[in-house]
Interface confidence: low
């Protein structure tokens, strides 16, 4: 004869566990039904009656089979620096991710708790490592023969143009300026265009502050972002 199927609630055999989507209630000492995602336990089971489940109220959810007495509250609305990538429903929490130009400085189980603007490398510094969803931009000083004249979270250091005759030598934050009409190479996009001809490689002067190339300090709630590292700007 096939084994009789036990209906919840039932006392489990000694040493055995409750079945899938059931839980052992310590008080009743019975295996009882879990509530499905989108529901919660309104009344816990007894020896003679099974769990009574109820739908989650608005702005609350349960994602798993459960026996929690209250549904979880959905996270607060996404802030202005975030995008809602998953809406709050009875079965899932709202997920907020950082909008473009920002990264997640403090993550939570799903989505981001605190977004921060990507560091912008100031003139004389270029992007050594671009920002990602979870890491900040790393800036580095422009090496001799290269420059960056922008405050940007994406611009790298670019080579100086090569002049026949140098009017003004280039440095870390400025391209070389040539004296006559055309340089020997086409200029990098975004370089300041002054018509001039070509000369020797321009002299390069390093920027005085030596920046940290480490990512910015981790952000801790409830404080705001830590000051940006040298070679970067906060906005």
């Amino acid at each position: 004869l096939p084994a009789q199927v036990a209906f919840t609630p039932y006392a489990p055999e000694p040493g055995s566990t409750c079945r899938l989507r059931e839980y052992y209630d310590q008080t009743a000492q019975m295996c009882c039904s879990k509530c499905s995602p989108g529901q919660h336990a309104k009344v816990f089971c007894t020896k003679t009656s099974d769990t009574v489940c109820d739908s989650c109220e608005d702005s609350t959810y349960t994602q798993l089979w459960n026996w929690v007495p209250e549904c979880l509250s959905c996270g607060s609305r996404c802030s202005s620096d975030q995008v809602e990538t998953q809406a709050c429903t009875r079965e899932q929490n709202r997920i907020c991710t950082c909008r473009p130009g920002w990264y997640c400085a403090l993550s939570k189980q799903e989505g981001c708790r605190l977004c921060a603007p990507l560091r912008k490398c100031r003139p004389g510094f270029g992007v050594a490592r671009p920002g990602t969803e979870t890491s900040d931009v790393v800036c580095k000083p422009c090496a001799p023969g290269t420059f960056s004249n922008t405050t940007s979270s994406t611009d790298i250091c670019r080579p100086h143009q090569i002049c026949n005759v140098v009017a003004i030598p280039g440095n870390a934050s400025m391209d070389a300026v040539c004296t006559s009409t055309s340089p020997t190479r086409s200029m990098a996009p975004g370089a300041v265009h002054l018509p001039q001809p070509v000369s020797t490689r321009s002299q390069h002067t390093q920027p005085t502050p030596e920046p940290s190339t480490a990512p910015s300090t981790s952000f801790l709630l409830p404080m705001g972002p830590s000051p940006p590292a040298e070679g970067s700007t906060g906005d």
Partner: antibody
Framework: EVQLVESGGGLVQPGGSLRLSCAAS????????VSWVRQAPGKGLEWIGA???????YYSNWAKSRFTISRDNSKNTLYLQMNSLRAEDTAVYYC??????????????????WGPGTLVTVSS | DIQLTQSPSFLSASVGDRVTITCQVS??????LSWYQQKPGKAPKLLIY???TLASGVPSRFSGSGSGTEFTLTISSLQPEDFATYYC????????????FGGGTKVEIK
């Protein structure tokens, strides 16, 4: 400033009653899960119970019969009603809140905000 | 009742030592375990929640691990300000709870 402040402690005779208050400022109690925790002199922490953001109360086994947790949203205040007090109820009583109000209603993610505590002495 | 058993209950250590405290739970609580530090006359301070997540402003020398029934708090290099009492706390089970906290571990200077 986000804070919790307990009040209402003091000397009470055995068998007497006392109601402690926990006033919240800087956030709304109605959207928070807040616990009452006590600590007898020289002893460890003891969880009394909690009230969830939906208003459901939870109690430890020993507290169910004599302690009641309630909340007045209009005053942004949490209460602990203690009846039939005994000498062993002498302790510092704390209220404590989950670090974020959007999670399980009973300290699943710890209690990140605590009041300074109020001392209750039960003695004749 | 669900029981949280901390060990050791007392620990004598020196500055710079690596310290490990364990918390054993009588039934599975997934990862819903927190750790607190308490100094005499002060309210407890949350160190770690969800077993391994460092609370705001807590130094990185503190770390937590474990899930189910076995959990550990580790202080990688004990500092003078770390001498205190440490408690674990479960936040998963609400029915039939004796105490949500462990009995505590007092860390004293050797």
């Amino acid at each position: 400033e986000v804070q919790l402040v307990e009040s209402g402690g003091g000397l009470v005779q055995p068998g007497g009653s006392l109601r402690l208050s926990c006033a919240a400022s800087g956030f709304s109690l109605s959207s928070s899960a807040v616990s009452w925790v006590r600590q007898a002199p020289g002893k460890g922490l003891e969880w009394i119970g909690a009230i969830g953001s939906g208003g459901t109360s939870y109690y430890s086994n020993w507290a169910k019969s004599r302690f009641t947790i309630s909340r007045d949203n209009s005053k942004n205040t949490l209460y602990l009603q203690m009846n039939s007090l005994r000498a062993e109820d002498t302790a510092v009583y704390y209220c404590a809140r989950d670090p974020n109000s959007s999670d399980y209603p009973y300290g699943a993610y710890g209690m990140g905000l605590w009041g300074p505590g109020t001392l209750v002495t039960v003695s004749s | 009742d669900i029981q949280l058993t901390q060990s050791p209950s007392f620990l004598s250590a020196s500055v710079g030592d690596r310290v490990t405290i364990t918390c054993q739970v009588s039934q599975s609580i997934s990862s819903y375990l927190s750790w607190y530090q308490q100094k005499p006359g002060k309210a407890p301070k949350l160190l770690i929640y969800y077993a391994s997540t460092l609370a705001s402003g807590v130094p990185s020398r503190f770390s937590g691990s474990g899930s189910g029934t076995e959990f550990t708090l580790t202080i990688s290099s004990l500092q003078p300000e770390d001498f205190a009492t440490y408690y674990c706390q479960q936040g998963y089970i609400t029915s039939n709870v004796g105490n949500a906290f462990g009995g505590g571990t007092k860390v004293e200077i050797k």
